[in-house]
């Protein structure tokens, strides 16, 4: 599936996301992870998802954003983190979204 550009795994019970996902799907532009059980994001989580334009993370249990998980997403247009457990609008330790 290396040519895949859109992946919808919404409404599952995914609690951990392996960073190698995007290494195996280098063309991925749209990733929908809504309504899963993710609790944390790190700067490794999407490090290899450099072509993403849309990332849907709404309705998870994300409470911890460690370091700068979106710093490599130079093409990101849509990021949805609604309905999570974030206590701050700070999405990491530096400005990441240009």
């Amino acid at each position: 599936y290396s040519q895949l550009t859109s992946l919808d795994v919404g409404f599952n019970t995914i609690s951990k996301l392996e960073p190698e996902l995007c290494q195996k799907l280098p063309m991925l532009k749209v990733l929908n992870l809504q309504h899963n059980e993710l609790s944390q994001l790190s700067d490794k989580t999407f490090a290899f998802c450099t072509n993403l334009t849309e990332l849907h993370l709404m309705s998870n249990s994300i409470q911890k954003i460690k370091n700068n998980p979106f710093v490599k997403q130079k093409n990101l247009i849509t990021l949805d983190l609604s309905h999570n457990g974030l206590s701050s609008t700070k999405l990491g330790t530096q400005v990441q979204l240009e």
């Epitope: 960073p19 190698e20 944390q40 790190s42 989580t45 490090a47």
Partner: antibody, heavy 117, light 107 residues
Framework: EVQLQQSGAELGKPGTSVKLSCKVS????????MHWVNQRPGKGLEWIGR????????IYGEDFKTKATLTADTSSNTAYMQLSQLKSDDTAIYFC??????????WGQGVMVTVSS | DIQMTQSPPSLSASLGETVSIECLAS??????LAWYQQRSGKSPQLLIY???RLQDGVPSRFSGSGSGTRYSLKISGMQPEDEADYFC?????????FGSGTKLEIK
Amino acid sequence: EVQLQQSGAELGKPGTSVKLSCKVSGYNIRYTYMHWVNQRPGKGLEWIGRIDPANGDSIYGEDFKTKATLTADTSSNTAYMQLSQLKSDDTAIYFCAMGEFDYFDYWGQGVMVTVSS
Amino acid sequence: DIQMTQSPPSLSASLGETVSIECLASEGISNDLAWYQQRSGKSPQLLIYAASRLQDGVPSRFSGSGSGTRYSLKISGMQPEDEADYFCQQNYKYPLTFGSGTKLEIK
């Protein structure tokens, strides 16, 4: 299956150095952080530091900034820790561990380092 | 550095009994807490992360709870294989720090 295989026990003389290795199978270390933790005889766990194998960036605990040097080789999927200027209180079991979020999902079996003249 | 004060240092429990271990952080750690089990002569094994999330493959008799500075690990129904040392660890801030451990023995 993810496995962390550490090198064998080390006997070092005071003032010398030892280099420990931790070979990871079943997971690419570029996708995580490699940590090192020690446990002195009969004692608890103490964090030494961690390395990001993707770029070599390291963070050390205060007591280990001049004691430990962490490196990683992504081509062999191996992390290393060098302990320098060995002293008797460096005698401990040293564990490598993997963790993307600074807790440790997987651990090596541990290696005993004994410092004695 | 964040100090992790773990109690009790040792604990004896009968098979089937429910036991709790506590960890108190010197400042708030926002649920960035993990619990490990270390059987004699073995490496530690992750039980709980993010204060209450059960690591894959860990029996459901283990549970974690807490918030702010105070956290606990509960074993609901002690089993022979639960005889081990238990450690908490904060991953909120560097340097990462561990509690001093609790030795759990079968009565």
